[in-house]
């Protein structure tokens, strides 16, 4: 399977809320023995790997963020300590994989990655991640709302989290 | 915070039978593989085998095939193991330990405080 | 069964001293686990994936290698740090546990 992020760039206002999607493509096991483990990290472009450095989200570590379910069903965190951070990372029956950032501020801005593991019974085999920018930005020169910027040209589109 | 909590030591009678408990708090008891593992002295650790309490499915080690057998209870979040026709090999602490799945690795990541099954005439 | 041997079976080290300790696998794996055990107590997981610390174990710890053979390495030794450490593998059945590696500190 592999990884795809829809959007590579979204730039948003402060105080509002984003949604970060991946999305996981391409023939994914749905074997009884079969699990994903996904989450949701900060990083920075290394010059050799990005995604390779891990820092938390609000506090946040990838353990903090992260869901473990069967190939075949949908996941969501419900647990308060998310929450509490106005965060909250999602995956539907449709290979979408999100995180929902709530109440935005400028020390929201940075690189987001999302990593995708698929686990055969307790063996982990293929680990794949996805990287997206997030600009948040105040003052006259801020959009109204979250615009993202498509990973293959750049024609942007409104989108803002509920 | 994930504690899993086995049941008491206990002392018994060649050929007799044991079941210690293993209760699980703090996590989706269900969803997560719970592993027997046997320490004898000077004997380091040895992996009888699993249960995935969900399901009720079982991995056991050949070597403990007829000698343990897993039954799990999630209304009580409780997995148990039973050891049969017990001789002074099965004298050893027994550990129940929970599958953690951390950072997409899962591996051995809660242990109950141990078991200590002792078999003497 | 994968056998997993560990070496030295003892390790005798003085407080700042660099010591490593090996395990060995009868085929080859794609990681490694490690975990400690102090006397008395249940094991803890220390190294995940060959070289990942657990939360909470001290960045002296280290642990690397690949295929057959993998090792867990500590900088500057610690008292606290005397405990036996051993390597598991879960790829196949019967998952195993290396002999172990009791650490004594001098």
């Known amino acids: 399977f592999k990884v795809a992020t829809l959007y590579s760039l979204y730039v948003c206002p402060e105080g509002q809320n984003v949604t970060l999607t991946c999305r996981v493509f391409g023939p994914v096991d749905k074997g009884h023995d079969v699990t994903f483990y996904k989450t949701w990290y900060r990083s920075s472009r290394g010059e050799v790997q990005t995604c390779s450095e891990r820092r938390p989200i609000r506090n946040l570590t990838f353990q903090d963020l992260h869901l473990h379910h069967g190939g075949h069903q949908a996941a969501n965190t419900s647990h308060d300590l998310a929450q509490r951070h106005g965060l909250e990372s999602a995956s539907d029956h449709h290979g979408n994989f999100s995180i929902t950032m709530r109440n935005l501020t400028l020390l929201d801005s940075g690189l987001y990655c999302c990593l995708v593991v698929e686990i055969r019974h307790h063996h982990s085999e293929h680990r794949v991640h996805g990287a997206m920018e997030l600009q948040v930005q105040t003052g006259k020169d801020a959009p109204s709302s979250c615009v993202a910027y498509p990973s293959s040209s750049q024609e942007s589109e409104n989108i803002t989290a509920a | 915070q994930v504690q899993l909590q086995q049941s008491g030591a206990e002392l018994m009678k060649p050929g007799a039978s044991v079941k210690i408990s293993c209760k699980a708090t703090g996590y989706t008891f269900s969803r997560y593989w719970i592993e027997w593992v046997k320490q004898r002295p000077g004997h380091g650790l040895e992996w009888i085998g699993e249960?995935?309490?969900?399901?009720?499915?079982?991995n056991y080690n050949e070597k403990f095939k007829g000698k343990a057998t897993f039954t799990a209870d999630t209304s009580s979040n409780t997995a148990y193991m039973q050891l049969s026709s017990l001789t002074s090999e099965d004298s050893a602490v027994y550990y129940c330990?929970?599958?953690?799945?951390?950072?997409?690795?899962?591996?051995?990541?809660?242990w109950g405080q141990g078991t200590l099954v002792t078999v003497s005439a | 069964q994968i056998v997993l041997s560990q070496s030295p079976a003892i390790l005798s080290a003085s407080p700042g001293e660099k010591v490593t300790m090996t395990c060995r696998a009868s085929?080859?794996?794609?990681?490694m686990h490690w975990y400690q055990q102090k006397p008395g107590s249940s094991p803890k997981p220390w190294i995940y994936?060959?070289?990942n610390l657990a939360s909470g174990v001290p960045a002296r710890f280290s642990g690397s290698g690949s295929g057959t053979s993998y090792s867990l390495t500590i900088s500057r030794v610690e008292a606290e740090d005397a405990a036996t450490y051993y390597c598991?593998?879960?790829?196949?059945?019967?998952?195993?546990f290396g002999g172990g590696t009791k650490l004594e500190i001098k």
């Open positions: 249960i995935l309490p969900g399901s009720g499915s079982t």
């Open positions: 598991q593998q879960w790829s196949s059945n019967p998952y195993t």
């Open positions: 330990a929970g599958e953690e799945v951390y950072d997409g690795y899962p591996w051995f990541g809660y």
């Open positions: 085929s080859s794996l794609s990681y």
């Open positions: 994936a060959t070289s």
